[in-house]
Amino acid sequence: TQNKALPENIKYGIVLDAGSSHTSLYIYKWPAEKENDTGVVHQVEECRVKGPGISKYVQKVNEIGIYLTDCMERAREVIPRSQHQETPVYLGATAGMRLLRMESEELADRVLDVVERSLSNYPFDFQGARIITGQEEGAYGWITINYLLGKFSQKTRWFSIVPYETNNQETFGALDLGGASTQITFVPQNQTTESPDNALQFRLYGKDYNVYTHSFLCYGKDQALWQKLAKDIQVASNEILRDPCFHPGYKKVVNVSDLYKTPCTKRFEMTLPFQQFEIQGIGNYQQCHQSVLELFNTSYCPYSQCAFNGIFLPPLQGDFGAFSAFYFVMNFLNLTSEKVSQEKVTEMMKKFCSQPWEEIKTSYAGVKEKYLSEYCFSGTYILSLLLQGYHFTADSWEHIHFIGKIQGSDAGWTLGYMLNLTNMIPAEQPLSTPLSHSTYV
């Protein structure tokens, strides 16, 4: 017989990440005969759904179907028709929906019900919509980056896939920042944990992993900003809030009802003598940093060591991949380079925050003002969270790698979620027979 390539049997999977600020649809593909190998699944498409997160549709659920249409139609185009019926579709909702569920389980269920009905109308194998836990979000993010970095592979490669990949099998920790929550997940040096709530055990590809994880609800960048505003308005003498986290010359009116809408601001809620207040930016990094630090309660710790708010955190260990908003924000600020020290990042932030709003608008004319106005806060928040929240130091800063994609796949929880639900991460190392992956006859 001739060495003729057989047509590859390709499988597809779809995961929708229903985040607090938006929904993204990811399409993954892999060779069917290699589905238990590590690193064979890769992302072929990301489609960002136009509009806010699904939790914002609670009063207009009849619009959910239309909201999801474009990206689902895109999936219909990308995936060959012959594969539609066997392509699983999963939707995982994160902290935005966790917060809605805290306010009203009935309303959260209504949104999920309509989402499920809408998605079931497509010709795929719809596997349901659910709110994933913070622990799952952390764990699946950790699985994703280590899967993509080849950390579960027993084959040592003589080449390096990505600049920060080392050939050792030490896993990377995962730092995930969303709009409403943030997760930290890593394998600590010490296998015994003081807090069982934060402990996960995995057996992946024949190896045991004892993983620490925690998800801080309300400490995503958007909810952290609402918290900070609610805290600071308490001590404002009138309806003007001079805010160091916004550029000099920036002005914005905020409704008090919007401020207190989220459960994240409940601890700061008080009766104010006004319905609205105006943020006036003064652009001072140091003051902004101080204000942000007040969101982290570090005075109480029932363990040997804590992050903040009395949550156990073991000593940091190894390299960390920081993704999602950690990456988006730092990438916008041009601070993702491995060569930029923590001191340099702080310097750059000071400079950026002090730039006048008019100047910023001119320099970044293509960026939506709503997002543009918040980069000073977000950058400051990221530094505060990593340094004071998680106890990274100037030295350990170089172990943080700001990652957008690995091998063309977005870093985030979605790939890990799909790998788990499709049983593509075996507990034991698959036996690789010499001819098992041959595509030639």
Epitope: V61, D109, R110, D113, V114, E116, R117, G128
Partner: antibody, heavy 121, light 107 residues
Framework: QVQLVQSGAEVKKPGSSVKVSCKAS????????ISWVRQAPGQGLEWMGS????????NYAQKFQGRVTITADESTSTTYMELSSLRSEDTAVYYC??????????????WGQGTMVTVSS | EIVMTQSPATLSVSPGERATLSCRAS??????LAWYQQKPGQAPRLLIY???TRATGIPARFSGSGSGTEFTLTISSLQSEDFAVYYC?????????FGGGTKVEIK
Amino acid sequence: QVQLVQSGAEVKKPGSSVKVSCKASGGTFESYGISWVRQAPGQGLEWMGSIIPEFGIANYAQKFQGRVTITADESTSTTYMELSSLRSEDTAVYYCARESGGYRDHRLDVWGQGTMVTVSS
Amino acid sequence: EIVMTQSPATLSVSPGERATLSCRASQSVGSNLAWYQQKPGQAPRLLIYGASTRATGIPARFSGSGSGTEFTLTISSLQSEDFAVYYCQQYLLWPLTFGGGTKVEIK
């Protein structure tokens, strides 16, 4: 106690359409989903689709996509199921049934009496 | 879609005896499973939901058990009015799917 009352039996020609109604009485209508299930003579139950009358949101079994349309009229507490391009295999009793809950709670706790649809040339 | 398989197709039982009906799902449905009874010329009637909770007005002789992929409907002591066809249905995911039914007939 909620009751679902369906329209009467129909005899239809192949290629035509049929529209069956289901009127709810004696309870709240809009907050529940209404499913349509059919049963061919001597066969089992087959789910066709569902609607939340309050929002007009419908979803359908893939088998019937493009051929079935489920609608609701809140003012009369009536749900409709229209099946087009009828063929002899569509001869069946068509039931409407109330879904008792919301998210992942689609047990069917109240059923209509059924509507016999015969497709014959 | 989730495929529901019922066994046996027909069950011959004497009045007063116990009847055990099985239902298997092609993937886990948790406890999102219902059982229905249907008599000739009538609409189905909900007996059990949540795999084991009896619906309003259903006699205690009907009981459901199981979770995940394996479910059982037990009729502890068959009465004459219990001879009928029984269907299981999963309601975890769309499309809602029914088993093929088990006919319980008089032995």
